[in-house]
Interface confidence: medium
C-alpha cells in the first residue's frame, strides 16, 4: 500500500484559530482503516472521514477546526496491512500567533525604597518575541528580547506594573501586577484570658493586618495593675496566636496588653485586659474528727479550720464524705462544724472524713473516722479501728 | 439511490433480548460508518454510537456504554443493534444513520446524511 | 458526559429571522453540524462543519460558530421551516457524539 499525506509540505505553519484539513491518501488496498497519529499517540476523534476515490484508492480526512499551540507537533497516517503496520511520512505542524507568557509579573510586597525585581518571558512561534514593560500607563525604556527582568530601585506607594510581548503576529499584554508597600502590622484583637488557675493562665488573640508581611512574633505584657510595674513579659513566634503565662501569683489583679511585629517592626499595643489569678485551696485538714451517737441518729463534729495564708481567702462550707461497706455512699455541705448524719446503716461499719472548701476547691480530707457497727460512739484513727 | 432498511417495530418485556438491524443499498457498505441514534417518544435524539467500516472499532456514547452492543455483518451489508436484557426505559425509536457522505466535489465529507426510517422498539410488561 | 445546550423553543412570524443557538465547551475546537425534524419524519442535516450548507438545502439557511456557541439562521423564515432542530457536535476529546437538546421552531 502506498500512503502519502496529500496537499500539506513537511512543515506547515499555521495561524491560531484557523481550520487545518490533513488528507492522507492511500493507494493500493481496497478497504483500508486508516488511523491518525500525532507525536505518537493515535488521534481519538470521530472526524476522522473516509472519502473513496476509486477502488483501491481513498482518502482520509483529520479535520482540526481551530487550531491551538496544544495542536502543533508531528502527524502522520497509518493502516495495517497483512499484519503490519505502514506510515506515511509525517507532517510538522507549527501553529503561530500573537506571544504567549510562560512568565507574567507576579504581586509583591516591599518595604518603602527597597529594590525589587519583576520578570517576564514569552514565546512564539514566531520567534523573536521582544517585551516591553509599562509602569502604570507610562512605558518604561524599550523593548528588550524574551525572557525579561525589570530591575525597580524602589517605589513610595502601591504601584501597578504590566509587560507586553510583541512578535510579527501581534502582541500580547501580561496580567497586571501590583506592588503593594509593606507596613507595620495592625494592633491585635479579640484578646481573650482562658483556662486561669491560681499560677498560670492561658492567653488567645487574633491578629491585626499584618501589613503585608509576614508576622513573625507577638509580645505578651503582663503589669499587676494597668500602668503599674511590669511583672513579665513573653515574646512568642506565630502563628499560633496563644501564649501560657507561667509562675503567677495566686489571688492576684493583673492586666496585659499584645502586640505583634513583622519584619518592619512591632504593631501598637492592644487595649489592656484585665484578670485575676484563682487563690489557693485550704492548705490543712479539719482535726478532731468525732461522733456522738444518739436515739435519732448520729452526730458528727469536728473543729474549725483558721486560714494559714490570706491567698487561701475566706473559708467556706465543709464537705462531709461517708461511705458504708455495703456500698452506700454520700456527701453532704455543712456551713458549720457540726453535722447529723441521717441515712446510714447502723448495723454496718461507717468510715467517715470531711475537709474544708473556698472559691478555689476543697482542702486534704481529714484523717478518716471508722464508726463501727458495734460502737455507741467513734473517734478519729485509722480505717476499721475500733472506738469505745 | 442510497438506502437504509430497518428491521421492523417490536414490542418486548423487560429482561428479554433483542437484535434490530439496518441493511445498506446504493453503495458499497465497507465505504462508510454506521452510527445509531436514540429517539424516546417526545423526546430529542441521542448519539448512542458509531461502528467502523469494517467493524474493527466501536465508539459508544457514556449512557449506552456496556448496555447495547453495536456489530456489522460486511457480507449481507447490514450494521445491528443488540439488547441482552431490555428496560422499560429502552422504549424509543431507534435510527440507523449513514457517518460520513460526499459532495458533488466528491472531497468534503458531511455527517449523517442518510437516515434510516427508524425502528420502533416498545418494552411494556 | 458532554453537554450541548439549545433553548427549548423559538418562535417567529414568516418572513422574520430565526436564530437558535448551541452552546458547548468544545464548540471553539469541534465543528457543529444542524439536523432538521420534522414530525413523524426521520431528520434531515441542513448544516455541516459550522456553516457549510448541505446539498438541496435553502439559501436562507445559514450557520455560525464563535467561541462556545454555534447558531443557526434561517433568514426570512417560511410556515414549511416549522420543526425541531438539533444541534451535533463531538466531545472534548473526540470519542463520542452529542446531540443537543433540540429547539422547537414555530413559525405563527
Known amino acids: 500500500a502506498g500512503l502519502k499525506l496529500m496537499g500539506a509540505p513537511v512543515k506547515l505553519t499555521v495561524s491560531q484559530g484557523q481550520p487545518v484539513k490533513l488528507n492522507c491518501s492511500v493507494e493500493g488496498m481496497e478497504e483500508p482503516d486508516i488511523q491518525w497519529v500525532k507525536d505518537g499517540a493515535v488521534v481519538q476523534n470521530l472526524d476522522q472521514l473516509y472519502i473513496p476515490v476509486s477502488e483501491q484508492h481513498w482518502i482520509g480526512f483529520l479535520s482540526l477546526k481551530s487550531v491551538e499551540r496544544s495542536d502543533a507537533g508531528r502527524y502522520w497516517c497509518q493502516v495495517e496491512d497483512g499484519g503490519e503496520t505502514e506510515i506515511s511520512q509525517p507532517v510538522w505542524l507549527t501553529v503561530e500567533g500573537v506571544p504567549f507568557f510562560t512568565v507574567e509579573p507576579k504581586d509583591l510586597a516591599v518595604p518603602p525604597n527597597a529594590p525589587f525585581q519583576l520578570s517576564c518571558e514569552a514565546v512564539g512561534p514566531p520567534e523573536p518575541v521582544t517585551i516591553v514593560w509599562w509602569r502604570g500607563t507610562t512605558k518604561i525604556g524599550g523593548p528588550a528580547p524574551s525572557p525579561s527582568v525589570l530591575n525597580v530601585t524602589g517605589v513610595t506607594q502601591s504601584t501597578m506594573f504590566s509587560c507586553e510581548a510583541h512578535n510579527l503576529k501581534g502582541l500580547a499584554s501580561s496580567r497586571t501586577a501590583t506592588v503593594h508597600l509593606q507596613a507595620l502590622p495592625a494592633a491585635p484583637f479579640n484578646i481573650t484570658v482562658t483556662k486561669l488557675s491560681s499560677s498560670n493562665a492561658s492567653v488567645a488573640w487574633m491578629p491585626g493586618a499584618d501589613g503585608r508581611a509576614l508576622l513573625q512574633s507577638c509580645t505578651v505584657q503582663v503589669t499587676q495593675a494597668p500602668g503599674g510595674w511590669e511583672v513579665l513579659a513573653v515574646v512568642v513566634p506565630v502563628p499560633p496566636f496563644t501564649c501560657l503565662l507561667r509562675d503567677l501569683v495566686p489571688a492576684t489583679n493583673y492586666s496585659l496588653r499584645v502586640r505583634c511585629a513583622n519584619a518592619l517592626g512591632p504593631s501598637p499595643y492592644a487595649d489592656w485586659v484585665p484578670f485575676q489569678t484563682k487563690g489557693l485551696a485550704p492548705a490543712s485538714a479539719p482535726q478532731n474528727l468525732h461522733a456522738i451517737r444518739t436515739d435519732s441518729g448520729l452526730i458528727l463534729e469536728w473543729e474549725e479550720v483558721i486560714p494559714e495564708a490570706p491567698l487561701e481567702g475566706p473559708l467556706g462550707p465543709y464537705k462531709l464524705s461517708w461511705v458504708q461497706d455495703n456500698g452506700t455512699q454520700d456527701e453532704l455541705t455543712v456551713e458549720g462544724t457540726r453535722a447529723n448524719l441521717t441515712g446510714w446503716d447502723p448495723q454496718k461499719d461507717l468510715i467517715v472524713r470531711v475537709c474544708v472548701s473556698n472559691a478555689v476547691g476543697c482542702g486534704p480530707w481529714s484523717q478518716p473516722l471508722v464508726v463501727s457497727s458495734h460502737d455507741r460512739a467513734g473517734q478519729q484513727g485509722p480505717p476499721h479501728s475500733r472506738t469505745s | 439511490e442510497v438506502q437504509l432498511v430497518q428491521s421492523g417495530a417490536d414490542v418486548k418485556k423487560p429482561g428479554a433480548s433483542l437484535t434490530i438491524s439496518c441493511q445498506a443499498s446504493g453503495y458499497t457498505f465497507t465505504d462508510y460508518w454506521i452510527s445509531w441514534v436514540r429517539q424516546k417518544p417526545g423526546k430529542g435524539l441521542e448519539w448512542m454510537g458509531r461502528?467502523?467500516?469494517?467493524?474493527?472499532?466501536?465508539y459508544y456514547g457514556p449512557s449506552f456504554q456496556g448496555h447495547v452492543t453495536i456489530s456489522a455483518d460486511r457480507s449481507t451489508a447490514t450494521a445491528y443493534l443488540q439488547w441482552r436484557s431490555l428496560e422499560a426505559s429502552d422504549t424509543a425509536m431507534y435510527y440507523c444513520v449513514r457517518a460520513g457522505g460526499q459532495t458533488s466535489g466528491g472531497t468534503i465529507p458531511e455527517y449523517y446524511q442518510h437516515w434510516g426510517p427508524g425502528t420502533l422498539v416498545t418494552v411494556s410488561s | 458526559s458532554y453537554e450541548l445546550t439549545q433553548p427549548p423553543s423559538v418562535s417567529v412570524s414568516p418572513g422574520q429571522t430565526a436564530r437558535i443557538t448551541c452552546s458547548g465547551d468544545?464548540?471553539?475546537?469541534?465543528?457543529a453540524y444542524w439536523y432538521q425534524q420534522k414530525s413523524g419524519q426521520a431528520p434531515v442535516l441542513v448544516i455541516y462543519e459550522d456553516h457549510k450548507r448541505a446539498s438541496g438545502i435553502p439559501e436562507r439557511f445559514s450557520g455560525s460558530s464563535s467561541g462556545t456557541m454555534a447558531t443557526l439562521t434561517i433568514s426570512g423564515a417560511q410556515v414549511e421551516d416549522e420543526a425541531d432542530y438539533y444541534c451535533?457536535?463531538?466531545?472534548?476529546?473526540?470519542?463520542?457524539?452529542?446531540f443537543g437538546g433540540g429547539t422547537k421552531l414555530t413559525v405563527l
Open positions: 451535533y457536535s463531538i466531545s472534548p476529546a473526540g470519542n463520542y457524539g452529542v
Open positions: 468544545a464548540l471553539p475546537k469541534k465543528y
Open positions: 461502528i467502523s467500516r469494517h467493524g474493527s472499532q466501536t
